[in-house]
């Protein structure tokens, strides 16, 4: 059977050209966005940055797996990036976009 | 056909007896923990409380679904509960446990 790895951060480089955003984003050309994936299975160890609720949900899932899902693997720390882009009036704008880069993942 | 509902909060009452915790937790007997479940599919509307990263990840998933998963539905707001319990020395303790109740969910 497929045994997914435990919840963790995976590397992902996102190219703005691939997203079709190259006409309005001047710089950067892309960025290391990363993503979270993996199992949040019992027992939730310290690496999994689990909330108290996630711990409770995991125990309830084990008792009642048909109705209550496992917690999911989601970002716990996100960073911003600065983007240079054209606005609707073709002005060049430098803006900081929050919550763009995954720095850490956990079970939520 | 499989049409999973969009990411949202679901009601869940957790009984401490069901968890086998009745011998050390005096009160409450249980609590409304709730949980998050549902799809984080394109387009991520305002109800889904999506982060910028989740929006980017959704677009990357559409391009490359085998490699990058959809964002997951996780708590965005959590509340504490107060618990009266026996410690290891049989002292009665009142403690506030953080992040025990899901108040809102979103795509992360």
């Amino acid at each position: 059977s497929e045994l997914k790895t435990a919840c963790k951060k995976h590397e992902l480089y996102v190219s703005f050209q691939d997203l079709g955003w190259q006409d309005w984003i001047i710089a950067p050309k892309g960025y290391a966005a990363n993503y979270c994936d993996g199992e949040c299975s019992f027992p939730l160890n310290a690496h999994m940055n689990a909330t108290n609720h996630a711990i409770v949900q995991t125990l309830v899932h084990l008792m009642n797996p048909e109705y209550v899902p496992k917690p999911c693997c989601a970002p716990t720390k996100l960073n911003a990036i600065s983007v240079l882009y054209f606005d609707d009036n073709s002005n060049v704008i430098l803006k900081k976009y929050r919550n763009m880069v995954v720095r850490a993942c956990g079970c939520h | 056909s499989e049409l999973k509902t969009a990411c949202k909060k679901h009601e869940l009452y957790v009984s401490f007896q069901d968890l086998g915790w009745q011998d050390w937790i005096i009160a409450p007997k249980g609590y409304a923990a709730n949980y998050c479940d549902g799809e984080c599919s394109f387009p991520l509307n305002a109800h889904m409380n999506a982060t910028n990263h989740a929006i980017v990840q959704t677009l990357v998933h559409l391009m490359n679904p085998e490699y990058v998963p959809k964002p997951c539905c996780a708590p965005t707001k959590l509340n504490a509960i107060s618990v009266l319990y026996f410690d290891d020395n049989s002292n009665v303790i009142l403690k506030k446990y953080r992040n025990m109740v899901v108040r809102a969910c979103g795509c992360h």
Epitope: L62, M63, E66 | E2, T5
Partner: antibody
Framework: QVQLVESGGGLVKPGGSLRLSCAAS????????VHWVRQAPGKGLEWVGR??????????AYAASVKGRFTISRDDSKNTLYLQMNSLKTEDTAVYYC????????????WGQGTLVTVSS | QSVLTQPPSVSGAPGQRVTISCTGS?????????VHWYQQLPGTAPKLLIY???ERPSGVPDRFSGSKSGTSASLAITGLQAEDEADYYC???????????FGGGTKLTVLG
Amino acid sequence: QVQLVESGGGLVKPGGSLRLSCAASGFTFSSYVVHWVRQAPGKGLEWVGRIKDHKQGYTTAYAASVKGRFTISRDDSKNTLYLQMNSLKTEDTAVYYCARVERSKSGFDNWGQGTLVTVSS
Amino acid sequence: QSVLTQPPSVSGAPGQRVTISCTGSSSNIGAGYSVHWYQQLPGTAPKLLIYGSSERPSGVPDRFSGSKSGTSASLAITGLQAEDEADYYCQSWDSSQTLVVFGGGTKLTVLG
């Protein structure tokens, strides 16, 4: 009282198709996860697959032995569960049961009486 | 080959105690999932006997009890009666995709 009644079984040739139904009554069918379980003559119970409730988006899952050949669906307005069986093989010969999953501990608390499917040339 | 392993048969005299084991692995019982037990009398559909590893549905006599430890579970029947002669199945979940798994079944024979 809770009742599950299967129908649609019978004799079918290898490669053929059959659709089983499971009529539910005595409970709010739409709120429950329901499964198909089969039992070959003189053998043990074998899980076939399940469909979740409306809250969980009717998501389905199947045993490896039937994946791609069998399809589970449900019509909550008719309180009925279905099992569409295609490309049937002789090893699919069995009594097919539908079973309801109780909501607190996920046990199969109610079963139908079963319907016999015989795949033979 | 079933995912959960049960002895094919057990037997006991009326009034005796018998136990039926159910051995799994780290991806099912060992992952923490509950175990349920079903009784199947000859020619009938299975019936839920023990749920949540150790709880009895209403109407099930307290002669039946269940327990779970590590990667195994067991069903105990005390004060064996002739009407207990049946097939018994354990059931749990596989953690990778939360799919149902059954034991191969155990035939209980009440002697004499």
